[in-house]
């Protein structure tokens, strides 16, 4: 029990449990389809322990297998709107370093206004994850509708 208490007092990152849960800050200017994220206790239910934000993009600090998850809800959206706007897609990938650039998730909204997905994937220190939303609808900034996070699972 004493060990468990001591363990609870250690910072998560010292245990290798890098984790981040982010909320949407803003979209980029035109020709920049990236979503820009923010996180921290002052913002409510978002946090970063280990990974960090670099100009709104999530950068990994520890090698390992991560669970990456994301949910995006389109603002002012109905099923009719969503089907009309079928080009709207969300992609999550490693955008830097360029040598490791790869798409990890690609999702289309089709008939719905919300997409949510997750996957396990190896990530390395220095990897920056970008989330690109293309189409002609804006994402909701409500924290229970649009969020993005990673969780270190194992080396």
């Amino acid at each position: 029990q004493r060990f468990a208490q001591a363990q609870q007092q250690l910072p998560l990152e010292s245990l290798g449990w890098d984790v981040a849960e982010l909320q949407l800050n803003h979209t980029g200017p035109q020709q920049d389809p990236r979503l820009y994220w923010q996180g921290g206790p002052a913002l409510g239910r978002s946090f970063l322990h280990g990974p960090e934000l670099d100009k709104g993009q999530l950068r990994i600090h520890r090698d390992g297998i991560y669970m990456v998850h994301i949910q995006v809800t389109l603002a002012i959206c109905s099923s009719t709107t969503a089907s009309r706007h079928h080009p709207t897609t969300l992609a999550v990938g490693i955008c830097s370093p360029a040598s490791r650039s790869i798409s990890l998730l690609r999702l289309s909204f089709h008939q719905g206004c919300t997409i949510a997905s997750q996957r396990l994937t190896p990530l390395a220190r220095g990897d920056t994850l970008c989330t690109n939303l293309t189409g002609t609808l804006l994402p909701s900034r409500n924290t229970d509708e649009t969020f993005f996070g990673v969780q270190w699972v194992r080396p």
């Epitope: 080009p87 002609t136 994402p139």
Partner: antibody, heavy 118, light 107 residues
């Protein structure tokens, strides 16, 4: 009926800012995106950006990024478009237009002529 | 950006004529194309959306067709009130772009 009523004509000096208003009526203000489009004298239509009145989020055309700001006052169902660092080539009629849910603009405001001249 | 090219840029026609205006997109935009009519000193008015759907209240002499990159607006029998400038608009992706306009004049 659905109506968008814009503020009156403005004359500004180069380097100044202008703030154009667009008052919506006849529908639920927060349920539709609003766009801003401008038209220089004798020229075509140029899209400036999209605004979400429900949460204030925006997406601006690259050309105007850093100079344009779109805001709203939900109590009066009014959207504002502010353009800063004005230059003579910003002389144009500025229109607000409601997005009817298909990135289709209907109706449009009557337009606001902004003249930039020293 | 997706470039929209309209032709012709101006056109003279007579009442009763059949007129066709074309709009070409620089890349595939599916059917994400609208047509607007603008009269001098007035705001544009929506005529056709989704390339071929007629907006409510617009006379049936207006029709639209096309998909992919090539689109047309046809006025089957010109009326005096149809003399105006017509714009196509792509709504496939941001930034939204318009054609340069086609000015329809009385011959």
């Amino acid at each position: 009926q659905v109506q968008l009523v814009q503020s009156g004509a403005e004359v500004k000096k180069p380097g100044a800012s202008v703030k154009v208003s667009c008052k919506a009526s006849g529908y639920t203000f927060t349920s539709y995106y609003m766009h801003w489009v401008r038209q220089a004298p004798g020229q075509g239509l140029e899209w400036m950006g999209i605004f979400n009145p429900s949460d204030g989020s925006t997406s601006y055309a690259q050309k105007f990024q850093g100079r344009v700001t779109m805001t709203r006052d939900t109590s009066t169902s009014t959207v504002y478009m502010e353009l800063s660092s004005l230059r003579s080539e910003d002389t144009a009629v500025y229109y607000c237009a409601r997005d009817v849910g298909e990135t289709t603009f209907d109706p449009w405001g009557q337009g606001t002529l902004v003249t930039v001249s020293s | 950006d997706i470039q929209m090219t309209q032709s012709p840029s101006s056109l003279s026609a007579s009442v009763g004529d059949r007129v066709t205006i074309t709009c070409q997109a620089s890349q595939d935009i599916s059917n994400y194309l609208n047509w607007y009519q603008q009269k001098p000193g007035k705001a544009p008015k929506l005529l056709i959306y989704d390339a071929s759907s007629l907006e409510s209240g617009v006379p049936s002499r207006f029709s639209g067709s096309g998909s992919g990159t090539d689109f047309t607006l046809t006025i089957s029998s010109l009326q005096p009130e149809d003399f105006a400038t017509y714009y196509c608009q792509q709504t496939n992706s941001f930034p939204i772009t318009f054609g340069q306009g086609t000015r329809l004049e009385i011959k």
